[in-house]
């Protein structure tokens, strides 16, 4: 088993990265002299207990700096948030942390992220730009849920 | 507030089947871990398995695999221990526990009270 | 299958400070056993009071506090009052299975 998280980088199909701006993941066009949060993930160790065929279960992270995406519910609402949180304390867990696990699904180059707590519910950004990252249902509509992850080795 | 009622007392002849029921209240089942855990006398306590109520997932402890059978029905917020080929051995207090990540660990904790199996003829 | 064995009963006064430990035969208990107690009082109620080896649970009096000694897990009441007499036990996690330990009648003599 890998047993260190992977980095990556991630940008979606309007070649928007994710940047950290006050603790918060946003979406914005790639510049000059911009910092994009590289990710870490790494697979659920646990991934037999988990439901098959919905992707591979990965917590989600951002590489050295103690902050792992979650899903909770605000009211009767899943919200994304960033807590911090040392990715491999979640892996190393004797069960599935699923408030930080996502289901990663590959399509070609497309990846998506659904929540394990919330299922039917992706990481997504709104078409605007410039706006935090959310959880959605609505998938194809006003949000975008297709991003490309490159892995960095 | 956060409780688990378990099913009352059984009393079952060896060779036959039997199903225990625990019924949570107060929090959503399917944001937790249900344990069962078995207790005899003198004997301190024994972990039979898990069920994860959100997927149906199980795991259970290689003694008791293929002799219990961990169900959850969604529905009514209820999980199941089945035992089946009962023998006296499986005389014991069968407890339900919860067990809940808070914070940066998984706690086991809340359990129910407790249901009384005898296995006699 | 790992064996986890505690001391089968303590005795303690109130105010004074009281260690149980949880051992395990297939070598040192670390962090990744995630080391839980669990209190059981009369009538078979029981309640748990550390997870992660050393978190205390919500609502949890801050006199018992779960900790590491050399090869064991520990837990120490620093204070205990008579309300803590009842038996403990430890859950140890190996992999992919929990085993208890045979737990520790604890008597607070008041």
């Known amino acids: 088993k890998i047993d260190t998280p992977q980095r990556g980088s991630i940008q979606d199909i309007n070649h928007r990265v994710w940047v950290l701006q006050d603790q918060t993941l946003i979406a914005v066009p790639r510049k000059d002299r911009m910092s994009p949060v590289t990710i870490a993930l790494i697979s659920c160790r646990h991934v037999e207990t988990l439901e098959k065929d919905r992707g591979n279960p990965i917590y989600l992270g951002l590489n050295g700096l103690n902050l792992c995406l979650m899903c909770a519910k605000v009211g009767d609402q899943p919200t994304l948030q960033l807590k911090e949180k040392d990715i491999m304390d979640l892996y190393n867990q004797p069960e599935p942390v699923k408030s930080f696990l996502f289901y990663h699904s590959q399509s070609g180059r497309n990846s998506t992220f659904e929540s394990v707590a919330f299922p039917g519910w992706f990481i997504a950004v709104s078409s605007e730009g410039g706006c935090p990252l959310i959880l959605t249902q609505e998938l194809g509509k006003a949000n975008t849920t297709d991003f490309g992850l490159t892995m960095l080795f | 507030e956060v409780q688990l009622q378990q099913s009352g007392a059984e009393l079952v002849k060896p060779g036959a089947s039997v199903r225990l029921s625990c019924t949570a209240s107060?929090?959503?089942?399917?944001?937790?871990?249900i344990h069962w855990v078995k207790q005899r006398p003198e004997q301190g306590l024994e972990w039979i398995g898990r069920?994860?109520?959100?997927?149906?997932?199980?795991r259970y402890d290689p003694k008791f695999q293929g002799k219990a059978t961990i169900t959850t029905d969604t529905s009514s917020d209820t999980v199941h221990l089945q035992f089946s080929s009962l023998t006296s051995e499986d005389t014991a207090v069968y407890y339900c526990?919860?067990?809940?990540?808070?914070?940066?660990?998984?706690?086991?904790?809340?359990w129910g009270q407790g249901t009384t199996l005898t296995v006699s003829s | 299958q790992a064996v986890v064995t505690q001391e089968s009963a303590l005795t303690t006064s109130p105010g004074e400070a009281v260690t149980l430990t949880c051992r395990s035969s297939?070598?040192?208990?670390?962090?990744?056993?995630?080391a839980n107690w669990v209190q059981e009082k009369p009538d078979h109620l029981f309640a748990g009071l550390i997870g992660?080896?050393?978190d205390r649970a919500p609502g949890v009096p801050a006199r018992f506090s779960g900790s590491l000694i050399g090869d064991k897990a520990a837990l120490t009441i620093t204070g205990a009052q008579t309300e803590d007499e009842a038996i403990y036990f430890c859950?140890?996690?190996?992999?992919?299975?929990?085993?208890f330990g045979g737990g520790t009648k604890l008597t607070v003599l008041g």
């Open positions: 526990a919860r067990l809940h990540y808070f914070g940066n660990n998984f706690f086991f904790d809340y």
């Open positions: 107060g929090f959503n089942i399917k944001d937790t871990y």
């Open positions: 069920i994860d109520p959100a997927i149906g997932t199980t």
């Open positions: 297939s070598g040192a208990v670390t962090t990744s056993n995630y």
């Open positions: 992660g080896t050393n």
């Open positions: 859950a140890l996690w190996f992999s992919n299975h929990w085993v």
